[in-house]
């Protein structure tokens, strides 16, 4: 349960996260399991520990083995194991199965291929993408943040996709590649003009001054995976991020659910420590996709607090 396989190619950077999480963690110590020898934290070393992360800059075949991480806190020490294998670079184009990350599926409407493990690295856009070793070119392919988007996906788009990026550590650059298979599934989906399920139009939401309040904007957009669909909140017609009130935040990321086969999204607006002035604002739940935009407006009203313990 607390062991994780990691792999990489020689002369590339490899960064491994400790499979145990601290709750909380104060320090993390790393050891070579075979020798119980501590891994240094000084960055001048080719292999060094940096908190939850173990860094091979760059990796060598001889680094293969099991590494122990101990997440320390006053209450508990939690032990995890990272099983690291470093492979020699292949001279031919084929990527062997043991170097492949999990397969992802896509369809005409959803063709995102995420670059595996990239979140562990200090990288800057753009990513380079290859399919079966050929650099991807043409307007159908768009490298966006940490993923590749393929427009108008066809069955011929199935194959092995490799992302390549540069990890920067203290001014030194290291190459990283990661490969995963992409399969195309035929999806009989459709999209509709957005339908907002909550809140109701012109809904009045009762809140208590000084307490926290949550507003959920929930909308459905059709059947199957939707390529372009979003829900968001606006305050007095302004984006939450531009409104500049730190107490009022949208929940990061949109939750996707499938209700009766319908593709739905919801976004929670969290208002901390509700103030009188919040009652004067207009809260707009917006749902938009390729068909257009729908808006439902909510206002807050004061609820008389019932005396109770927290």
């Amino acid at each position: 349960k607390f062991s994780k396989q990691s792999w990489g190619l020689e002369n590339e950077a490899l960064i491994v996260r400790c499979p145990r999480q601290g709750k909380p963690s104060y320090t993390v110590d790393w050891y070579y399991s075979q020798t119980n020898k501590s891994i240094p934290t000084q960055e001048r070393n080719r292999v060094f520990a940096s908190g939850q992360l173990l860094k091979f800059l760059p990796a060598a075949v001889a680094d293969s083995g099991i590494y122990t991480c101990i997440v320390r806190s006053p209450t508990f020490n939690r032990t995890g194991y990272a099983n690291v294998t470093i492979y020699k670079k292949q001279s031919d184009c084929n990527v062997p199965d043991y170097l492949m990350y999990s397969t992802v599926s896509g369809s005409e409407k959803n063709s995102k291929i995420y670059c595996p493990t990239i979140d562990l690295y200090n990288w800057t856009a753009p990513l380079e993408w290859f399919k079966n070793c050929q650099a991807l070119q043409g307007s159908r392919y768009r490298a966006h943040k940490s993923f590749l988007v393929i427009d108008n996906v066809m069955t011929e788009d199935a194959g092995d996709y490799t992302c390549k990026f540069i990890h920067n550590e203290n001014g030194a650059n290291y190459s990283v590649t990661a490969t995963r298979s992409f399969t195309v599934k035929d999806e009989q989906g459709f999209s509709l003009f957005p339908v907002i399920g909550a809140p109701a139009q012109n809904e009045i939401k009762e809140v208590e001054i000084g307490k926290n309040a949550n507003l959920t904007c929930s909308a459905c957009f059709g059947k199957g995976t939707q390529f372009l669909a979003a829900v968001l909140w606006q305050l007095n017609g302004t984006k939450i991020t531009d409104f500049g009130e730190p107490r009022i935040q949208q929940e990061e990321g949109q939750n996707q659910s499938f209700s009766n086969g319908l593709a739905c999204l919801d976004m929670v607006l969290r208002i901390a420590d509700v103030k009188e002035e919040d009652l004067l604002l207009q809260y707009d739940c917006l749902a938009l996709n390729l068909h257009g935009l729908r808006r439902h407006t909510v206002r807050l009203s004061r609820k008389n607090p019932i005396d109770h313990h927290s």
Partner: antibody, heavy 118, light 112 residues
Framework: QVQLQQSGAEVVRPGASVTLSCKAS????????MHWVKQTPVHGLEWIGA????????AYSQNFKGKATLTADESSSTAYMELSSLTSEDSAVYYC???????????WGQGTTLTVSS | DIVMTQAAISNPVTLGTSASMSCRSS???????????LYWYLQKPGHSPQLLIY???NLASGVPDRFSSSGSGTDFTLKISRVEAEDVGVYYC?????????FGSGTKLEIK
Amino acid sequence: QVQLQQSGAEVVRPGASVTLSCKASDYTITDYEMHWVKQTPVHGLEWIGAIDPETGDTAYSQNFKGKATLTADESSSTAYMELSSLTSEDSAVYYCSRSATDYYFASWGQGTTLTVSS
Amino acid sequence: DIVMTQAAISNPVTLGTSASMSCRSSKSLLHSNGITYLYWYLQKPGHSPQLLIYQMSNLASGVPDRFSSSGSGTDFTLKISRVEAEDVGVYYCAQNLELPFTFGSGTKLEIK
């Protein structure tokens, strides 16, 4: 909003045992440690111990070893504290409190009042 | 055990003015990782304690920025810049550096 719902007030006889419960909602109980704290007018807030619900590992204050036993049930998202060989000194309000990613005592239950009286 | 020392009652303050209270630990709460494991909690009358400040100077989620905290390894101060009626209660400092975790005896904030 993370909630910790504690069991109701208890009145028990000296020498008896009692089990207090703390039900976690809106998060997975195995994700964070659960701590228990005692509060009395005389001694204020005292840390009793903690449990890691993921593994069942426990840590206790020396003052409460043999007095408190901490357990957790993942299926019901509930943490328990059993107090044994009760005396009037054990009369107090007991709180459960969960840790967060970066710190302890992030949120607290509403407290359970325990009265030990003959 | 690390002993946390607080004054029992702060000087009564007027609403809208600032208030401060101190806390002292019997051992430095500065960890080798660079973090100072000093915490402040507020317990309002009839309620559970609630986290205000973690790791000496970080404001917990939802806590107004009227609250701030500073200190060295052993001496700490909690400051409330504009006291409101809802700030009334007992303020506890606590250490999470090592077991057993310990709390101060609390400082009661009173309004004039």
